[in-house]
């Protein structure tokens, strides 16, 4: 006996899809070798039309594809518009056609409906509308109109000329008479549901001359579109509901238990708390179009989803829907990475953010996650040279360690740092990553003076006090600018007298500006790092002025001024609208920008739900106000 | 309140036939998948046959053990599910159920993935 299982028979229809599983067991050697699906000929053999490695027949090219879900031990052919042709017998199968390890399955494809039997044949999906159409001759222009529904072996009023209508359609139904000129009437039903399915008779007059013709109704549930991502990756649902429903609540809920559909977002701002920090729904087209991208995805991620529009921001009968079945991928290709970063009030964090190795030019982003409405997250810094300019002398984007990984490190940390935030490029989308960072009480490692003033032509000599724990790690100081932080030489001062408890491995680095110039003013960091993994630092602003008294300036760390909470923008900075530049493969269903590089004083856009908005300066300009 | 009744048991001789009939009502939505599963005295529910419905597709699956002997068939607008079974054998001896699941998520001879069930109707088949 094979141990494939699958379908023994399936029945559709011309024009119809089928969506064939065929399952397999999940041993290693299973899970990845070659999956196909091929029609068995007259003779005995088994010609491939699909299979996993790539290829596809000529038959099925551009209506069918082959998916493989290696952790739940199963491969999904589908194949779109069927024809009668495509009647016949098939094998799903593992490794090599002529094998055993395959499973028959028999296709049959029936002709499309049509005009049977006088009977016009309406398919129509769910929570959409459907226009019966209902002939009827000259004498009965001026006689009751009127639709019928067989329930059993009687026929109920659904609608008629007179004004009635059915309880069970009420305010989602209507009958017209068109001019005098055409000999027709139409019945129009809205927000289609399931039990709308079924025979319908429409009749023009009562007696026996009456105008009678008989429809059937076919509402149909979508079937759901299979989405296979990886573990940690991210999912973006398109939403297309047509322009009808542009101005009514949408929703994306996952299915549970039965027909219940938990609401994972709606544009009515609720949101499932599993989703908080890793969930943005983008704002909707004119035609009601409308995305959801979800990040950090989870095994319990999986599922069925729907999303649809209704009054209530909620699934109901008569919503339009689309469906998607989420698998996520357990051997995924994105690393595990922290999804919880904790750092200390003061201090700072070193976020790690994967990205797709293959892509190592792409430009490289980190954002602010925002909850407000429908979710929306503020670009902070990319890899080309552009911090938001709240984050001046705080933030940096490094390329290292490179090869699949990025940093950002963020100091001056303060209790409004903490949330979520998203690691992303222009490249793959589905290599956006999420962390949350969290603030916990403590001291900061790093022991440096507050804000620094240093002479013009002077030298300055700024301390960083390492203790003990950074022993093995080296030590650096660095120029901040938005392009990163250049190293400095600094000297190594011995140990150092700042800590209590900590012995002769602590150390003094101090930072040396000799002849000091204006263009030595601005933020500088110390830090820790092992190899391109970078640990704590802490930063220290200095201004440069006019000569007052003649020598050289030693800071310690009591001299020091107190670091001001925040820099605030000159009276003259110009905050402009955010005039986003679409880059088509920078989130296609995002609001995000490309490139602002010309705006002079430009802000940086978002991924976003909302329209323009006023995001910050860019510190391409610098301005600081001490 | 969702019921699943099932008809149609009873003694059969070794070779013999029987047709058992599965009516659900208050089913929510449009079923997706209705199946059939035996039970033996002592033993697990074990999956014997199904068919899954999406839009005006239908996927029909067997057991091995009864492949070429039994068939089902089904209404889904009528919410009807029938197993007709043929060349009956003394293990096919069992407490027959039907379930029914309003999606077609999971294999579909796993029980766990059916949310409703039936009573059962009892298959004797012995001379």
């Known amino acids: 006996k094979s141990p494939i299982f699958g379908p023994e028979e399936v029945n559709s229809v011309e024009g119809n899809s089928v969506s064939i599983t065929c399952y397999y067991p999940p041993t290693s050697v299973n899970r990845h070798t070659r999956k196909y699906w091929c029609r068995q000929g007259a003779r005995g053999g088994c010609i491939t039309l699909i299979s996993s490695e790539g290829y596809v027949s000529s038959k099925y090219a551009g209506r069918a594809n082959l998916t493989n879900f290696p952790e739940n031990g199963t491969f999904v052919v589908n194949i779109a518009q069927l024809s009668q042709d495509d009647s016949g017998r098939y094998k799903c199968g593992l490794g090599i056609n002529s094998r055993g390890l395959s499973f028959d399955v028999s296709l049959e494809v029936s002709q499309g409906p049509g005009l049977l039997n006088d009977t016009k044949v309406y398919t129509v999906d769910l929570g959409r509308t459907v226009t019966i159409n209902c002939p009827f001759k000259t004498e009965n222009a001026q006689k009751r109109k009127s639709l019928y529904k067989q329930i059993g072996l009687y026929p109920v009023l659904v609608i008629d000329s007179s004004g009635y209508v059915n309880p069970n359609y009420t305010g989602r139904i209507r009958l017209d008479i068109q001019g005098t000129g055409q000999l027709l009437f139409s019945v129009v039903i809205n927000q289609l549901r399931l039990s709308d399915a079924g025979q319908y008779l429409c009749q023009a007059g009562d007696d026996s001359n009456s105008n009678k013709k008989n429809a059937d109704l076919q509402v149909l549930k979508p079937e759901p579109e299979l989405v296979y991502e990886d573990l940690r990756g991210s999912v973006t649902f398109h939403c297309a509901l047509g322009p009808e429903v542009a101005n009514v609540a949408k929703f994306l809920c996952r299915q549970s238990s039965g027909e219940n559909c938990d609401v994972v977002v709606n544009t009515l701002g609720k949101r499932a708390p599993a989703f908080e920090g890793r969930i943005l729904l983008n704002p909707q087209d004119k035609d009601g179009s409308f995305s959801v991208v979800i990040t950090g995805l989870r095994k319990e991620d999986a599922g069925r989803y729907l999303c649809g529009a209704h009054s209530d921001g909620q699934l109901q009968e008569g919503s339009p829907i689309q469906a998607w079945q989420l698998f996520v991928n357990e051997e995924s290709t994105i690393p595990r990475s922290p999804t919880v970063v904790k750092g200390v009030a003061g201090s700072s964090v070193a976020v790690l953010c994967p990205y797709n190795r293959k892509e190592s030019k792409s430009i490289k982003y980190w954002c602010l996650w925002e909850g407000a409405q429908n979710g929306r997250c503020p670009l902070l810094v990319d890899s080309e040279g552009w911090v938001k300019a709240q984050y001046e002398g705080r933030l940096s984007l490094l390329e290292e360690p490179g090869n699949g990984t990025f940093t950002v490190i963020l100091n001056q940390l303060t209790s409004r740092d903490a949330g979520f935030y998203w690691c992303l490029t222009n490249g793959d989308t589905l290599w956006r990553t999420t962390v949350e960072i969290k603030i916990i009480e403590g001291e900061p490692n790093l022991k440096v003076p507050g804000n620094v003033t240093a002479v013009l032509g002077e030298t300055l000599k700024v301390p960083c006090h390492f203790p003990c724990k950074f022993s093995s790690y080296e030590k650096y100081w660095c120029k901040w600018n938005n392009t990163g932080c250049q190293a400095l030489p600094s000297q190594d001062e011995g140990p150092s007298k700042a800590f209590v408890n900590c012995d002769e491995n602590s150390r003094l680095v101090s930072l040396t500006l000799n002849l000091v110039t204006r263009a030595d003013e601005g933020w500088y960091w110390c830090g820790v790092k092992q190899g391109h993994f970078y640990g704590e630092t802490a930063a220290v602003y200095v201004a440069v002025e006019e000569r007052k008294a003649a020598g050289s300036r030693d800071v310690s760390l009591a001299k020091a001024d107190a670091a001001p909470d925040e820099k605030v923008l000159d009276s003259g900075f110009r905050e402009i609208e955010n005039k986003a530049i679409q880059d088509p493969r920078l989130f296609a269903e995002e609001k995000a920008v490309a490139d602002t590089r010309d705006q002079a004083d430009g802000s940086r856009a978002s991924v976003d739900s909302g329209s323009s908005e006023e995001q910050g300066g860019s510190s391409r300009h610098h301005h600081h106000h001490h | 309140e969702v019921q699943l009744v099932e008809s149609g048991g009873g003694l059969v001789q070794p070779g013999g036939s029987l047709r058992l009939s599965c009516v659900a009502s208050?089913?929510?939505?449009?079923?997706?998948?209705m199946a059939w599963f035996a039970q033996a005295p002592g033993k697990e529910r074990e999956f014997v046959a199904a068919?899954?419905?999406?839009?005006?597709?239908?996927?029909?699956y067997y057991s091995d053990s009864v492949k070429g002997r039994f068939t089902v068939s089904g209404d889904n607008a009528k919410r009807t599910l029938d197993l007709q079974m043929k060349d009956l054998n003394p293990e096919d001896t069992a407490l027959y159920f039907c379930?029914?699941?309003?999606?077609?998520?999971?294999?579909?001879?796993?029980?766990?993935?059916?949310?409703?069930w039936g009573q059962g109707t009892q298959v004797t088949v012995s001379s």
């Open positions: 068919i899954a419905w999406r839009g005006r597709t239908s996927y029909k």
């Open positions: 208050g089913l929510p939505g449009s079923s997706s998948r």
């Open positions: 379930a029914a699941h309003p999606n077609d998520d999971g294999d579909p001879r796993i029980s766990g993935n059916y949310q409703y």
